[in-house]
Interface confidence: low
Amino acid sequence: QPSVSPGEPSPPSIHPGKSDLIVRVGDEIRLLCTDPGFVKWTFEILDETNENKQNEWITEKAEATNTGKYTCTNKHGLSNSIYVFVRDPAKLFLVDRSLYGKEDNDTLVRCPLTDPEVTNYSLKGCQGKPLPKDLRFIPDPKAGIMIKSVKRAYHRLCLHCSVDQEGKSVLSEKFILKVRPAFKAVPVVSVSKASYLLREGEEFTVTCTIKDVSSSVYSTWKRENSQTKLQEKYNSWHHGDFNYERQATLTISSARVNDSGVFMCYANNTFGSANVTTTLEVVDKGFINIFPMINTTVFVNDGENVDLIVEYEAFPKPEHQQWIYMNRTFTDKWEDYPKSENESNIRYVSELHLTRLKGTEGGTYTFLVSNSDVNAAIAFNVYVN
């Protein structure tokens, strides 16, 4: 028992005065705590705790589940403990089968013994399978068996605690190790489209894909320079054990001009963070802007060729394009094509090819274009010398 200087509060005294006690199943456990300021006994095993306000703890018929640490505490908060093993040949292990290990950390297989005098307390693979060669463990009869530095490869490993009793190997119930992967890289994030152009009242919907080793990756859509919480919906999949994918879809059902801005999909884990942005532009109505690629006043010599070229921006997409001269529409000699094959493209090119012009073919050539919201036109004045 501990000794202290006179005048200082001392820890309680426990009888029997030993750190460990072994009793047989069915026998009596009788523990006496002596202290003028006795407060309580506490019993702990695995995640269970039990309290007793009597200074004598009596269990008339001990069972294997009475194995554990009995602690007496006094009013000064000082305590003393005794560990009791209840030897039961039919129940050598107490078991908490939940077994989770964080990658690169140690984890405890919780199978404390009821008899500390059995031998060869260790781990064994299920169905006689060997354990991974690099798996290291440290047995502790009072706590269980500590697996050192859990590897990702141990995920779903089936194992038993094992002891030798009278020359025979006895196995506990089986444990399945679930490994929580450590984050060793930032999440991978991507967005369905880098920019969106919409008219007022149209729906804005954008999807961010987040990939990581586990579902505990955090992700959110944020509006740049705004704290407003955005409404998002999630879909997620586990493609195998350490390949997790989440799709976070942000929707604004009826976009307004002031919804325009940059939206960021942000994801982070314990390793770091990553983000990707998309730009939304909302216009009150559609538009067409025409840019001549040559001067709108053109001088050519008789018999020469000239190409009249315009670029134009149209949103929504152009529906009707035509070149007109003297109230007549050209059916050929011109072509119209998108400037890029990108699905976000709003820029187009139109070219009218005039060949071997005669003096009588001078005048005003007009390009007309329309979409569902607006019409636009540009005129070229051609002089043939």
Partner: nanobody
Framework: QVHLVESGGGLVQAGGSLGLSCAAS????????MGWFRQAPGKEREFVAA????????LYADSVKGRFTISRDNGENTVYLQMNSLKPEDTAVYYC??????????????????????WGQGTLVTVSS
């Protein structure tokens, strides 16, 4: 995906009270036990209190028993920690945590840190003497 956000921390005089809240999103909150832990500077993170999925079972660290009360509102996806008779030694960052390893619908609560898979970022409680 689980996201836990604590709030309610701050500076309080010894003997005063403070209420912490933890809002959970992204999980069927009502299926799981929840816990509060705390970490004082330079010390290990320690268990404070836990509550079962239904609120029927609670567990407290000896150091807070009788002073702190844990409760939950499954409709609001929120767990609370009411702290009364605060002492300077209660100064710490308080974390809320979700135990997704427990069996759905059991009254199980645990003080063991390793059982809790999801953690909030923490809220600082300072008790001045």
């Amino acid at each position: 995906q689980v996201h836990l956000v604590e709030s309610g921390g701050g500076l309080v005089q010894a003997g005063g009270s403070l209420g912490l809240s933890c809002a959970a999103s992204g999980h069927t909150f009502s299926n799981y036990a929840m816990g509060w832990f705390r970490q004082a500077p330079g010390k290990e993170r320690e268990f404070v209190a836990a509550i079962s999925w239904s609120g029927g079972s609670t567990l407290y660290a000896d150091s807070v028993k009788g002073r702190f009360t844990i409760s939950r509102d499954n409709g609001e996806n929120t767990v609370y920690l009411q702290m009364n008779s605060l002492k300077p030694e209660d100064t710490a960052v308080y974390y809320c945590a979700l135990d997704s390893t427990g069996v759905y619908g059991t009254g199980y609560v645990s003080s063991r840190k390793g059982r809790y898979e999801y953690w909030g970022q923490g809220t600082l409680v300072t008790v001045s003497s």
